[in-house]
């Protein structure tokens, strides 16, 4: 979390940011709170990207105003105008690339006075992972594959049953490159799997962390996943 | 009340241009941008280009020798310019405006200009 | 380009019945597809936007649903006045591109 005040004449108002993380290809949210204003048309909010001469987006007197805005947004962002009057001036960003990480800066000036906060924006791709029993193999084995991830991450295997252990040998992780040449896809199996237990495939980079989990018993199989941002921190 | 119009010559001689205007009510050249889009008769919908509220522009690669589109914000209005015309060209042309700052729908349109390029 | 198909070209229903659309994207579009209505000698005019989102003013009978490459605009009880041809779009990348339409007639 980060929390910023202004340094103007006027008095200083409280912004604050919340690092966040963007998954190439869909919408991403820059989260950014400020002190409300009772005047709608009393508040400017400007969105600033470290490198970027244009603006990434900029809402005053009650509508945007994008006549600065810079080539690489545009068409691409909106703030939750209905919002705005409540003290919220978080962004909307449509179809997130690679290039959109970053450090942006959320400005605000209302009649109270002047604040910014900065918010650091990393970009890559994540997905879900689904852990399958591998029914085709000589062995009983299980399958994990998650669609989309990038950076390249690391795939780590666990058990319940046999906690500390290093599976590293009995597994074996590949990469394929999606087909629009960024992302990849993460298949990684592992061998010699025995049944009554519950395994664990954890996949993460510096963006996100995944595991899917699979308990295998003699009469069922129970599946369960969840994926987690790393790094969100306000400011 | 926001409000789109287009104004056309009706007809344009083959390898000819063609020039349309778009003026605009009920919002800011500056907050949004304007589509283009045309319709050949009994065919589909061709997206042909935009201008952005910056004056910056993205075309159709299919357009891109051939278009150009403008605007001057305090008269809002909105130019466009297409050269070498043949007889594919007849269709209506639309200027619209999308939903919101981004683009995720064409929410409102002019009333199109039937454009027939005949000699 | 992406290519955006529709189906049925055309289709006749009578008043009441319950009309799906179709639209596949040749690639994933994420939810930027769109659905317009045109009436014979009118511009067309947004029924759903973001896939799913009715336009302001749209009768509740209109729905959109999808995502990635499959889409479906659904009349839940058709009438006389939805004679018009329906066309979807896509507006996640360049060029911005739309489906040939589906002709619906009322029996």
């Known amino acids: 979390l980060i929390i910023g005040f202004g340094i103007s004449g006027r008095h200083s108002i409280t912004v604050t940011t919340v690092a966040s993380a963007g998954n190439i290809g869909e919408d991403g949210i820059l989260s950014c709170t400020f002190e409300p204003d009772i005047k709608l048309s009393d508040i400017v909010i400007q969105w600033l990207k470290e490198g970027v001469i244009g603006l990434v987006h900029e809402f005053k007197e009650g509508k945007d105003e994008l006549s600065e805005q810079d080539e690489m947004f545009r068409g691409r962002t909106a703030v939750f105008a209905d919002q705005v009057i409540v003290g919220n001036a978080s962004l909307r960003l449509k179809n997130v690339q690679l290039t959109d990480a970053g450090t942006y800066k959320c400005y605000i000036i209302t009649s109270k006075g002047k604040g910014n906060a900065n918010l650091e924006y990393k970009t890559g791709a994540f997905s879900m992972p689904e852990v399958n029993v591998d029914y085709n193999a000589s062995s009983e084995t299980l399958r994990c594959e998650a669609p989309r991830w990038f950076p390249q991450p690391t795939v780590v295997w666990a058990s319940q049953v046999d906690q500390g252990a290093n599976f590293s040998e009995v597994s074996n992780t590949s990469f394929e490159l999606n087909s629009e040449n960024v992302t990849m896809k993460v298949v990684s199996v592992l061998y010699n799997v025995t049944i009554n237990n519950t395994y664990s495939c954890m996949i993460e980079n510096d963006i996100a962390k995944a595991t899917g989990d699979i308990k295998v018993t003699e009469s069922e199989i129970k599946r369960r996943s969840h994926l987690q941002l790393l790094n969100s921190k306000a400011s | 009340q926001i409000q789109l119009q287009e104004s056309g010559p009706g007809l344009v001689q083959p390898s000819q241009s063609l020039s349309i205007t778009c003026t605009v009510s009920?919002?800011?050249?500056?907050?949004?941008?304007v589509q283009w889009v045309r319709q050949s008769p009994g065919k589909g919908l061709e997206w042909l280009g935009v201008?952005?509220?910056?004056?910056?522009?993205d075309y159709n690669a299919a357009f891109i020798s051939r278009l150009s589109i403008s605007k001057d914000n305090s008269k809002s209005q909105v130019f466009f310019k297409m050269n070498s015309l043949q007889a594919d060209d007849t269709a209506i042309y639309y200027c619209?405006?999308?939903?919101?700052?981004?683009?995720?729908?064409?929410?409102?349109w002019g009333q199109g200009t039937l454009v027939t390029v005949s000699s | 380009n992406i290519v955006m198909t529709q189906s049925p070209k055309s289709m006749s229903m009578s008043v009441g019945e319950r009309v799906t659309l179709s639209c596949k994207a040749s690639?994933?579009?994420?939810?930027?597809v769109s659905w317009y209505q045109q009436k014979p000698e009118q511009s067309p005019k947004l029924l759903i936007y973001g896939a799913s989102n009715r336009y302001t003013g749209v009768p509740d009978r209109f729905t959109g649903s999808g995502s990635a490459t499959d889409f479906t605009l659904t009349i839940s009880s058709v009438q006389a006045e939805d004679l018009a041809d329906y066309h979807c779009?896509?507006?996640?990348?360049?060029?911005?591109?739309f489906g040939s339409g589906t002709k619906l007639e009322i029996k």
């Open positions: 201008i952005w509220s910056g004056g910056s522009t």
């Open positions: 779009g896509q507006s996640y990348r360049y060029p911005f591109t």
């Open positions: 619209a405006r999308d939903i919101s700052t981004i683009v995720e729908g064409f929410a409102h």
């Open positions: 690639e994933k579009v994420g939810t930027y």
């Open positions: 009920g919002f800011s050249l500056t907050s949004y941008g």
